[in-house]
């Protein structure tokens, strides 16, 4: 299957019950600290507020945050990173009433509480050190 361009931007409309599904493979060995970044933008350009940033340091940790009024807020982290070196992953971000639920290969790793309403999200961007197979939104 051919790869998508990275960074990859996808216009979206999110609501409770939506799910963003990202499939890809890290392009570097974990010893080189490859990363995956997913941003939920509130408009179609990168200056807009970010309702949710999810950045994976493969083999290490995940950092999550949001940007409000152009200001980065309180960082949240988890060391539970069930990605495997060199193997394809499926990252699912479910939109629940109170949080984004993040699952990797079917395993829940975190719940990021909504601050900016999900209905404000207009674009998802996937970037950094991955070969990207697919990005889709289920409503």
């Amino acid at each position: 299957m051919s790869s998508l361009p990275v960074p990859y931007k996808l216009p979206v409309s999110l609501s409770v019950g939506s799910c963003v599904i990202i499939k890809g493979t890290p392009i570097h060995s974990f010893i080189n600290d490859p990363q995956l970044q997913v941003d939920f933008y509130t408009d179609m350009d990168e200056d807009s507020d970010i309702a949710f940033r999810f950045r994976v340091h493969f083999g290490n940790h995940v950092v999550m945050n949001r940007r409000e009024f152009g200001i980065w807020m309180l960082e949240e982290t988890t060391d539970y990173v069930p990605f495997e070196d060199g193997k394809q992953f499926e990252l699912c971000i479910y939109v629940h009433y109170n949080e984004y639920e993040i699952k990797v290969n079917g395993i829940r790793i975190y719940g990021f509480v909504h601050r900016i309403p999900p209905s404000f999200v207009k674009m998802v961007q996937v970037s950094r050190d991955i070969s990207l197979t697919s990005v889709c939104v289920c409503n």
Partner: nanobody, 119 residues
Framework: EVQLQASGGGFVQPGGSLRLSCAAS????????MGWFRQAPGKEREFVSA?????????YYADSVKGRFTISRDNSKNTVYLQMNSLRAEDTATYYC???????????WGHGTQVTVSS
């Protein structure tokens, strides 16, 4: 649809104080940061202050108002406040409140309240 209504503006002499209020309604925004912007005649709208909804409710200020303005919020009343002390002539502007998620675009700006500082 989000509705934001700012109030509390007025005419004050240099060195004086005012307290602005902004009540929000109409959307599930309670977790969003809330903030204040201002626009002086002939100038672009500029950031004044914002307050997060994190447990430690961090406050952020433009350099020009640090030490003089204090932002606070009352989540039970869905209201954000801006206490403005030691006002200067250059603080004269229309002040707008906003919720995050629409910055820097004017999707949900509140109706402004005019502040005039003059002797």
């Amino acid at each position: 649809e989000v509705q934001l209504q700012a109030s509390g503006g007025g005419f004050v002499q240099p060195g004086g104080s005012l307290r602005l209020s902004c009540a929000a309604s109409g959307s599930s925004y309670a977790g969003s940061a809330m903030g204040w912007f201002r626009q002086a005649p002939g100038k672009e709208r500029e950031f004044v202050s914002a307050i997060s909804s994190d447990p430690d409710t961090k406050a952020y200020y433009a350099d020009s108002v640090k030490g003089r303005f204090t932002i606070s919020r009352d989540n039970s009343k869905n209201t954000v406040y801006l206490q403005m002390n030691s006002l200067r002539a250059e603080d004269t502007a229309t002040y707008y409140c906003a919720i995050s998620g629409q910055y820097p675009y004017a999707r949900y700006w509140g109706h402004g309240t005019q502040v005039t500082v003059s002797s």
